[in-house]
């Protein structure tokens, strides 16, 4: 019998390389059975995760899974960093793995750097 616990399917150490100035949707895949849980996004600041209150979010429902989406319209250099989604379900808090956004500032970088270049050319990134 399939578990009816809420599950958040963000892969461990997942990351996205994205460009500032363009939109991006960060998805938190959520699996639940009957009632959809209350899900929030937060951004890691050291050891604490700061809840994102004034940000646009939405749900996308698919047949076997739902996605809680954090909208970046557009991505800003300040959006660089690690994010986590959390679900409140039957008084339990379920936290996802963190997912990291690497933001390239297209106004100061003429080309999008590869992951290898990110380490050697840190001025292209807000890290």
């Amino acid at each position: 019998k399939e578990s009816c616990d809420v599950q958040l399917y963000i892969k461990r150490q997942s990351e996205h390389s994205i460009l500032a100035g363009d939109p991006f949707e960060l998805e938190c895949p959520v699996k639940y059975c009957a009632n959809r849980p209350h899900v929030t996004w937060c951004k890691l600041n050291g050891t604490t995760c700061v809840k994102l209150e004034d940000r646009q979010t939405s749900w996308k429902e698919e047949k076997n899974i739902s996605f809680f989406i954090l909208h970046f319209e557009p991505v800003l250099p300040n959006d660089n960093g690690s994010y986590r989604c959390s679900a409140n379900f039957q008084s339990n808090l379920i936290e996802s793995h963190s997912t990291t956004l690497y933001v390239t500032d297209v106004k100061s970088a003429s080309e999008r750097p590869s992951k290898d270049e990110m380490a050697s050319r840190p001025w292209l990134l807000y890290r």
Partner: antibody, heavy 120, light 106 residues
Framework: QVQLKESGPGLVAPSQSLSITCTVS????????VHWVRQSPGKGLEWLGV???????SYNPAPMSRLSISKDNSKSQVFLKMNSLQTDDTAMYYC??????????????WGQGTSVTVSS | QIVLSQSPAILSASPGEKVTMTCRAS?????MHWYQQKPGSSPKPWIY???NLASGVPARFSGSGSGTSYSLTISRMEAEDAATYYC?????????FGGGTKLEIK
């Protein structure tokens, strides 16, 4: 220097469609977004939508079904098409450049606007 | 959608007078922009992200606020400040403008 210039038909008959072209100079459409904003006496300033640098679009959900924004990067032009115009679509239509700073996004350079009147 | 309510709708001030206009949002926003518009002209960026003056804007202007309440203040009114000022939020689509405050010189 940064410039945006709108060109439109001026007069449109009710139920017809509107096409406006925004020609930009001083910046690249692959780096900056271009927005469409209209201003009418009845509704004030209303954001219609944006063409993002990478080619995606975002629209105001209210008039979204009637709107289409496209661009030609090589010609530095952004296009607004709006279908099924009614008299309350009479307005000044502006194209506006969008720019980001480290932690905010704003519309900085505005075109002079093109006046559109919907009337038979 | 987030509704921005500006008050007062019309404001009349004498030269040298301190002027404050407000913009209230129906939901919390991260920051507020302000634009100035004079008759026959396009809106001009005036204050970015709550408190950053746009290029060329005199230092007598300032902006403040957070959450749902924001304001634009002129420390000493001058004749060239007569215009309509619009607040604008970029937190949630549709990205809305306030109805404007028309500032007149006495």
């Amino acid at each position: 220097q940064v410039q945006l210039k709108e060109s439109g038909p001026g007069l449109v008959a009710p139920s017809q469609s509107l096409s406006i072209t925004c020609t930009v100079s001083g910046f690249s459409l692959t780096t900056y977004g271009v927005h469409w904003v209209r201003q009418s006496p009845g509704k004030g300033l209303e954001w219609l939508g944006v063409m993002w640098p990478g080619g995606r679009t975002s629209y105001n959900p209210a008039p979204m079904s009637r709107l289409s924004i496209s661009k030609d990067n090589s010609k530095s032009q952004v296009f607004l098409k709006m279908n099924s115009l009614q008299t309350d679509d009479t307005a000044m239509y502006y194209c506006v450049r969008g720019d980001y700073e480290y932690d905010y996004y704003a519309m900085d350079y505005w075109g002079q606007g093109t006046s559109v009147t919907v009337s038979s | 959608q987030i509704v921005l309510s500006q008050s007062p709708a019309i404001l009349s001030a004498s030269p040298g007078e301190k002027v404050t206009m407000t913009c209230r949002a129906s939901s919390s926003v991260s920051y507020m922009h302000w634009y100035q518009q004079k008759p026959g002209s396009s809106p001009k960026p005036w204050i970015y992200a709550t408190s950053n003056l746009a290029s060329g804007v005199p230092a007598r202007f300032s902006g403040s606020g957070s959450g749902t309440s924001y304001s634009l203040t002129i420390s000493r009114m001058e004749a060239e400040d007569a215009a309509t000022y619009y607040c604008h939020q970029w937190s949630s689509n549709p990205y809305t403008f306030g109805g404007g405050t028309k500032l007149e010189i006495k």
